[in-house]
Interface confidence: medium
Amino acid sequence: DSEEDEEHTIITDTELPPLKLMHSFCAFKADDGPCKAIMKRFFFNIFTRQCEEFIYGGCEGNQNRFESLEECKKMCTRDNANRIIKTTLQQEKPDFCFLEEDPGICRGYITRYFYNNQTKQCERFKYGGCLGNMNNFETLEECKNICEDGPNGFQVDNYGTQLNAVNNSLTPQSTKVPSLFEFHGPSWCLTPADRGLCRANENRFYYNSVIGKCRPFKYSGCGGNENNFTSKQECLRACKKGFIQRISKGGLIKTKRKRKKQRVKIAYEEIFVKNM
């Protein structure tokens, strides 16, 4: 297997819920602007999901900039960290299962899943990439686990992978999102894909530091950031080597297998804003 085909899988005891932003500007990267002042400000970091300090130059920049930690938290965080993952003992669905699907106001359409209370099943929809509501899941399995009724009227707990010995067929499996990593490569490899401000639709690649892979995105032709490569190879060469995933206890688990493209996108890919 080549470096490009290697996939790092980690098992952790924590899993981040999909990131849902209250305001799309919370997804902007910290921008100190062109001026040279040294002003302590706060911005929302989509990777750590926390408000953090940065130094602002005093002019220009963007809306992801707040005078105080409290103001930042008020604008960009919501108390969704304690989302309940249902177990077979809890029959109540979370309230958000009853919300209608909401694509939000952005245009970076990605495939997501929502619970349709009318059909009583999880369905696929196109999420615009920002705002929306919590009836929005990265995977069909996660949606089913949380919102669908199991065969006995209980909530489905989780799926295990089962290989049918007769026909080698697969049954659904729940997948975990890697949530802990260290990065020792160029800093721009950590920035989100940035489409830029123009109207072109160029095929480019950016490094997704959450999953340690290069992913395609559409570049507008101008603006954006340095996490923008014309080929997957160039992207991997620049960024892949610096990525190390760790278990919370400090050990590293690596499994090698062929890369498999899936329609399901990782939560952090929702943060770039297309044609807002």
Epitope: Y109, K126, L140, S169, R263
Partner: antibody
Framework: EVQLVESGGGLVQPGGSLRLSCAAS????????LDWVRQAPGKGLEWVGD????????LYNQKFKGRATISVDQAKNSAYLQMNSLRAEDTAVYYC????????????WGQGTLVTVSS | DIVMTQSHKFMSTSVGDRVSITCKAS??????VAWYQQKPGQSPRLLIY???TRHTGVPDRFTGCGSGTDYTLTISSVQAEDLALYYC?????????FGGGTKLEMK
């Protein structure tokens, strides 16, 4: 060259079952979902459901839920549609189609297999 | 379910004509619309996805446009081989639904 070949169609009694196969070739099977779409004679297209070949996760049109089961066999690069409790209105050409996630559309279709439900 | 309505079941045209086939969704489908061509005895063929992007190998006389609930497939200069059934499909949410089809025929 991408090819999808359906088989298993034919005459079925009302109340009976059928199992259709879709053999895929010419691409990496696990890179794309496979969808089933049907078309009644002289009518339009109707989406039945789809499957992710990597983990077997399925989505169904609610209209067919409970009667339709889509499965996959990675070793054979094949997907299957099992339909139970068939009635006359299930008479149709059943197509399997490759669902390309980057397009969010069905970019290659099989030639279809005709299922006739009649006594 | 989202209903896709193609108001014209048939459209008459001549070679060289410009023709526009319309499709209306029962709710906003956020440009998640595909167009398929189906010739007699054949399976459908993808022409356009995401409302306006041409699939590989599709001649540039085929263009798609639209947003919200209203979408159009235009053939700028109809060729004899374009006489077929045309279906719109929304891929915004499952169940994916198709329009009833518009048959393009010669005058």
């Amino acid at each position: 060259e991408v090819q999808l070949v359906e088989s298993g169609g034919g005459l079925v009694q009302p109340g009976g079952s059928l199992r259709l196969s879709c053999a895929a070739s010419g691409y990496t099977f696990t890179d794309y979902n496979l969808d089933w779409v049907r078309q009644a004679p002289g009518k339009g297209l109707e989406w039945v459901g789809d499957i992710n070949p990597i983990n077997g996760a399925t989505l169904y049109n609610q209209k067919f839920k409970g009667r339709a089961t889509i499965s996959v066999d990675q070793a054979k690069n094949s997907a299957y549609l099992q339909m139970n409790s068939l009635r006359a209105e299930d008479t149709a050409v059943y197509y399997c189609a490759r669902y390309y996630g980057d397009y969010d559309a069905m970019d290659y279709w099989g030639q279809g297999t005709l299922v006739t439900v009649s006594s | 379910d989202i209903v896709m309505t193609q108001s014209h079941k048939f459209m008459s045209t001549s070679v060289g004509d410009r023709v526009s086939i319309t499709c209306k969704a029962s709710q906003d489908v956020h440009t998640a619309v595909a167009w398929y061509q189906q010739k007699p005895g054949q399976s459908p063929r993808l022409l356009i996805y995401w409302a306006s992007t041409r699939h590989t190998g599709v001649p540039d006389r085929f263009t798609g446009c639209g947003s919200g609930t209203d979408y159009t497939l235009t053939i700028s200069s109809v060729q004899a081989e374009d006489l077929a059934l045309y279906y719109c499909q929304q891929h915004y949410t499952t169940p994916y639904t198709f329009g009833g089809g518009t048959k393009l025929e010669m005058k």
